[in-house]
Interface confidence: low
């Protein structure tokens, strides 16, 4: 589990209708995920076996899953 | 109002290399991935990656790997994609997208001698 | 790679008609975050892409609510209501839970 720490996450349902998804991969989730924080929304990521986990991206609005 | 701006069309000779610019404007640029998609004559979509403006960190779909180039340019909220050694199969319609939600017209590659 | 398969192929539909769509996922869209990431865009003849709807079932502003999605899991529709001629063109759902991003290969509707 994880949480969403930006302070542009209370931001986002303004603009709830504007952006979608924007993350995705494969086999394994990510812990992490980078959120669309003006514009909305938040994609899946998930990751190869072989790829390392991005990074947490604060300032980013990135949410643990 | 988001925009997504590309050039219309590219013509490149087969073992050449093209790159294809994105700019956009009407959201924080650094707030969603910059996406590839392309789609050949005819055709329907693929995938070809993501790239992350707020710290340029890339996704590229495996067919792709080792021969196509992601940037971001956050001075000019301006994102590239180099493609090289082309082949005609890789004429194509390359759009970008603010992570499927926003998507750019789409600049024509033409590959051909 | 996650692949979805969309179908019919093509439709032919008369104005006023309803038409569905269907996108069949080979695992469940759903991430570990809850979400699902499932899109459906709207390519018209010479055109580019647009988003009608994301997870699974919200309408971006400005689409018609003659546009429906639905469906969980593995398996998704497009409803559309009351066909008009500028709904022709080719439907494609979408997902990016994971990577590979991957498409449908796409619905062409023709208005009769």
């Known amino acids: 589990g994880g949480s969403c720490g930006s302070e542009h996450y209370n931001m986002t349902s303004e603009f709830e209708e504007m952006l979608g998804g924007s993350g995705g991969s494969e086999d394994i989730y990510l812990e992490e995920r980078k959120t669309i924080k003006v514009l909305g929304g938040s994609g899946g990521s998930v990751e190869t076996d072989d790829q390392s986990p991005e990074k947490i991206n604060i300032l980013g609005g990135s949410c643990g899953s | 109002e988001v925009q997504l701006v590309q050039p219309g069309a590219e013509l490149r000779n087969p073992g050449a290399s093209v790159k294809v610019s994105c700019k956009a404007s009407g959201y924080t640029y650094t707030s969603a991935y910059i996406v590839w998609v392309r789609q050949a004559p005819g055709e329907g979509l693929e995938w070809m990656g993501r790239i992350d403006p707020e710290d340029g960190g890339t996704k590229y779909a495996q067919k792709f790997q080792g021969r196509v180039t992601f940037t971001a340019d956050t001075s000019t909220n301006t994102a590239y994609v180099e493609l090289s050694s082309l082949r005609s199969d890789d004429t194509a319609v390359y759009y970008c997208?603010?992570?499927?939600?926003?998507w750019g017209k789409g600049t024509l590659v033409t590959v051909s001698s | 790679a996650t692949m979805l398969t969309q179908s019919p192929g093509s439709l032919s539909v008369v104005p006023g008609e309803s038409a569905s769509i269907s996108c069949k996922a080979s695992?469940?869209?759903?991430?570990?975050?809850?979400?699902?990431?499932l899109y459906w865009l709207q390519q018209k003849p010479g055109q580019s892409p647009q988003r009608l709807i994301y997870r699974v079932s919200r309408r971006g502003s400005g689409v018609p609510d003659r546009f429906t999605g639905s469906g969980s899991g593995t398996d998704f529709t497009l409803n559309i209501s009351d066909m008009k001629a500028e709904d022709a063109g080719v439907y494609y759902c979408?997902?990016?839970?994971?990577?590979?991003?991957?498409f449908g290969s796409g619905t062409s509707v023709e208005i009769k």
């Open positions: 979408a997902q990016d839970t994971y990577y590979p991003y991957s």
């Open positions: 997208t603010a992570g499927l939600d926003y």
């Open positions: 695992q469940s869209l759903v991430h570990s975050d809850g979400m699902t990431y």
